[in-house]
């Protein structure tokens, strides 16, 4: 039977390396061993190339391109095709489409004034045009309390954030995930980071416990392990 | 050693053809673009087309389109330049030069940075 | 396509003086920041053109840095600083950012 796509491609950029263009077949595919999308930069001498796609379901394909640094005048010339038939041709520009990389190295370190504080990377080198637009989304959620979740907006410049352990229920296991967006890019937000999870132990001021006691008693206690949430 | 030696300049009559050749050698030359810029006894450089690494891309000057055709064979290492229909303003020398890194996803640009000696085209009856 | 236009058509100028040449192009040739598809050749009389400037400002391998090129979307210079006797000759722009790809007229250099 004939091969169509019955949701066309959908394509974001990191703006930096990769482009990922993803799209739904009207009906289970090989993508691999079925399709090509061809891509192909409008820029004088620019040569055509090809993506072999993979699938990320049945019916759903997805396509990594490999691209240059980009900059905003960059349009690629996007062709899908099955064998010799072309199913859709489109043109994509990577500055229009953004979505920012996801930040790494989520950790969580007790600091003074009974506080946690939060640390991340910034996904982009420093002379990256998305370095300095990034601001983030903190999320933080009570492992056994799925009503006890808190988010936190960081757009100031640092990849960091404090938060008051007495704003955390003591005693009780919490994970933070943080994601990124570039606000004058227009971007869509990157995936979350893998969680970080540590035991929040806070003894109210009243019990007069020294700081020393407190954090010797966080430090024990504190530890963090990594898994993924995806985002969708 | 970057060279390129055009070959094929002759005196042809006005209708004629004419092949030229630029055999490059001293750089990978799969990967680059190259061009082919012509000048008019006492004039100035004009630009008549470009061909892309690969040879899948080509490019050509509104004066020589339809009429004159590029291509490359890159296991010889060498550029052509297929010239038909000629007229007496295709009087010229003729320079073949390295253009722009073709490789890469977005063509990395050093200008046209090494140029043949030339060949003398002559079209008179 | 773009027009290339180069002033002036001739110019003289004594050993050690600097010399001025400037390109305007009818469209912008600014891809994006520090990309300025201008180019600077020079030709001596009976010699092949010999590439000076690229991308607007970058010097071209083993290019004096007497030689330098500035300005950026359709207006561009080039300078020739403490000029010598070696330096006459005819210099030409070009524009390398679409196809057809244009030079300026030229611009005759002579030493006094």
């Known amino acids: 039977g004939s091969v169509k796509v019955l949701h066309e491609p959908s394509c974001f950029s990191d703006y930096i390396s990769t482009s990922v263009c993803q799209w739904k077949m009207d009906h289970p595919t090989n993508c691999s061993a079925e399709l090509r999308l061809s891509y192909q930069l409008d820029f004088m001498g620019s040569e055509n190339h090809t993506c072999v796609p993979e699938n990320r379901e049945d019916s759903v394909c997805v396509c990594s391109m490999p691209i240059d640094d980009a900059v905003e005048a960059d349009v690629y010339q996007l062709d899908l095709w099955a064998g010799q038939q072309l199913l859709w041709s489109g043109s994509f520009q990577p500055s229009k489409h953004v979505k920012p990389r996801t930040p790494g190295n989520l950790t969580v370190h007790p600091n003074i004034s009974h506080t946690w504080l939060l640390m991340w990377t910034n996904p982009y080198p420093t002379e990256n045009h998305l370095h300095s637009e990034l601001t983030y989304m903190v999320n933080v959620s009570n492992d056994n309390d799925p009503e006890d979740f808190k988010v936190y907006n960081v757009t100031y410049m640092g990849p960091t954030l404090r938060l008051a352990a007495s704003t955390l229920k003591s005693g009780a296991s919490y994970s933070a995930r943080v994601r990124a967006w570039a606000q004058t890019y227009n971007s869509t937000w990157s995936d979350w980071s893998p969680s970080t999870t540590w035991l929040n132990y806070y003894e109210p001021w009243e019990q007069h416990l020294g700081l020393n006691d407190i954090f010797e008693a966080q430090k024990i206690e504190w530890h963090e392990h990594h898994h993924h949430h995806h985002h969708h | 050693e970057v060279q390129l030696v055009e070959s094929g300049g002759d005196l042809v009559k006005p209708g004629g053809s004419l092949r030229l050749s630029c055999v490059a050698s001293?750089?990978?030359?799969?990967?680059?673009?190259m061009t082919w810029v012509r000048q008019a006894p006492g004039k100035g450089l004009q630009w008549l087309s470009l061909i892309s690494g690969s040879g899948g891309k080509t490019y050509y000057a509104d004066a020589v389109k339809g009429r004159f055709t590029i291509s490359r064979d890159n296991a010889k290492n060498t550029l052509y330049l297929q010239m038909n229909s000629l007229r007496a303003e295709d009087t010229a020398v003729y320079y073949c030069?390295?253009?722009?890194?073709?490789?890469?996803?977005?063509?990395?640009?050093?200008?046209?940075?090494?140029w043949g000696q030339g060949t003398l085209v002559t079209v008179s009856s | 396509d773009i027009v290339m236009t180069q002033t002036p058509l001739s110019l003289s100028v004594s050993p050690g003086e600097t010399a001025s040449i400037s390109c305007r192009s009818s469209q912008s040739l600014t891809y994006s920041i520090g990309y300025n598809y201008l180019d600077w050749y020079m030709q001596k009389p009976g010699q092949s053109p010999q590439g000076l400037i690229y991308?607007?400002?970058k010097r071209a391998s083993g290019v004096s840095d007497r030689f330098s090129g500035s300005g950026s979307g359709a207006d561009f210079t080039l300078k020739i600083s403490r000029v010598e006797a070696d330096d006459a000759g005819v210099y030409y722009c070009m524009q390398g950012l679409q196809s057809p790809l244009g030079f300026g007229q030229g611009t005759k250099l002579e030493i006094k």
């Open positions: 991308l607007g400002s």
């Open positions: 030069a390295v253009d722009r890194l073709t490789k890469t996803i977005r063509p990395q640009y050093y200008g046209l940075w090494h």
């Open positions: 001293g750089f990978p030359f799969r990967d680059y673009a």
